[in-house]
């Protein structure tokens, strides 16, 4: 499985779209900052087998897609940008799915991978809960947008490391 330059370009486009999605000045939202406890260790990628890392990345994309495809999200962001964002995420998920199928045939994914995927799921649960508690306010969405941009950056870095291993 080769995470190609095309995939890398998709990553950059996803981050660019997220940057463009900004609706309000973030300087007004400092008091809404929140520690979502991003599962950093799941993206360090040193202890991972490749299949495991890919499935964690896939879960990250899937959860991001779920978060931004809710009714509340549609009301918060520009529809055209959201559509483009979905397309990029969908393309990345397809690439990663193809890789998982290819890699699992080569190596057995260890059970600890379930813990990694659970950590990502719980991270997104914390984000969803925060949005609910903040009543989906513009600042809450702005904080979440910044958080997702940061987590996607970690995903991109992990993918770069995987590409170097190829």
């Amino acid at each position: 499985c080769n995470l190609s330059q095309t995939h890398s370009l998709n990553n950059r486009r996803t981050l660019m779209l997220m940057a463009q999605m900004r609706r309000i000045s973030p300087f007004s939202c400092l008091k809404d900052r929140h520690d979502f406890e991003f599962p950093q260790e799941e993206f360090d990628g040193n202890q991972f087998q490749k299949a495991q890392a890919i499935s964690v990345l896939h879960e990250m994309m899937q959860q991001t897609f779920n978060l931004f495809s809710t009714k509340n999200s549609s009301a918060a962001w520009d529809e055209t940008l959201l559509e483009k964002f979905y397309i990029e995420l969908f393309q990345q998920m397809n690439d990663l799915e193809a890789c998982v199928i290819q890699e699992v045939g080569v190596e057995e994914t260890p059970l600890m991978n379930e813990d990694s995927i659970l950590a990502v799921k719980k991270y997104f649960q914390r984000i969803t809960l925060y949005l609910m508690e903040k009543k989906y306010s513009p600042c809450a969405w702005e904080v979440v947008r910044a958080e997702i941009m940061r987590s996607l950056s970690f995903s991109t870095n992990l993918q770069k490391r995987l590409r170097r291993k190829d």
């Epitope: 900004r22 400092l30 900052r33």
Partner: antibody, heavy 121, light 107 residues
Framework: EVQLVQSGAEVKKPGESLKISCKGS????????IGWVRQMPGKGLEWMGI????????RYSPSFQGQVTISADKSISTAYLQWSSLKASDTAMYYC??????????????WGQGTLVTVSS | DIQMTQSPSSLSASVGDRVTITCRAS??????LNWYQQKPGKAPKLLIY???SLQSGVPSRFSGSGSGTDFTLTISSLQPEDFATYYC?????????FGQGTKVEIK
């Protein structure tokens, strides 16, 4: 290694213009905001303003609004602080520092070494 | 604007002393409070962020506490290198504001 490197000391006359710089390295420059802080001789720290280099959105302290301009060039990972007409009271040490924006991370965790600006006739 | 008031403005202490500096905000700032140390001719250095989180690489003798309007920086056992000026700063809303500073001098 994260670094913020500021331009050298400046000696200027009242009424002159000036632009000082702060170059970031060792991290993603557009992922952090850059703040500017003034310290007049023998005095405390005063926050002047902040910029998001990803799109150059800027917020000033009311005390400095209209007195200075903060800008950034993300292509060269550099933020700027400029004056169009300096006054003797602008004599101070100016620091830049990075801020994590809306992400939960330490505020102003890295600082430049400071740029001493002296304004005297 | 949120005003930050530090006390005392200066204090004299000996090596090994326990030192406490307080910072009061003019309105509630939750836990959005940072502490910095500055030595003459040097840039400030972050010690504590989010009221009580110790910045990486900072000795554990430094600790922070408080939330709302009242905050404290404690140095459990003062070391020779701790003689400096300390500033609190709120990051709850812009304009971000600093306290006036507390100078810790040798007794």
């Amino acid at each position: 290694e994260v670094q913020l490197v500021q331009s050298g000391a400046e000696v200027k006359k009242p009424g002159e213009s000036l632009k000082i710089s702060c170059k970031g390295s060792g991290y993603s420059f557009t992922s952090y905001w850059i703040g500017w802080v003034r310290q007049m001789p023998g005095k405390g720290l005063e926050w002047m303003g902040i910029i998001d280099p990803s799109d150059s959105d800027t917020r000033y302290s009311p005390s400095f609004q209209g007195q200075v301009t903060i800008s950034a060039d993300k292509s060269i990972s550099t933020a700027y602080l400029q004056w169009s007409s300096l006054k003797a009271s602008d004599t101070a040490m100016y620091y830049c520092a990075r801020h994590p924006g809306l992400n939960w991370a330490p505020d102003f965790d890295y600082w430049g070494q400071g740029t001493l600006v002296t304004v005297s006739s | 604007d949120i005003q930050m008031t530090q006390s005392p403005s200066s204090l004299s202490a000996s090596v090994g002393d326990r030192v406490t500096i307080t910072c009061r905000a003019s309105q509630s700032i939750s836990s959005y409070l940072n502490w910095y140390q500055q030595k003459p001719g040097k840039a400030p250095k972050l010690l504590i962020y989010a009221a009580s989180s110790l910045q990486s690489g900072v000795p554990s003798r430094f600790s922070g506490s408080g939330s709302g309007t009242d905050f404290t920086l404690t140095i459990s056992s003062l070391q020779p290198e701790d003689f400096a000026t300390y500033y609190c700063q709120q990051s709850y809303s812009t304009p971000l504001t600093f306290g006036q500073g507390t100078k810790v001098e040798i007794k």
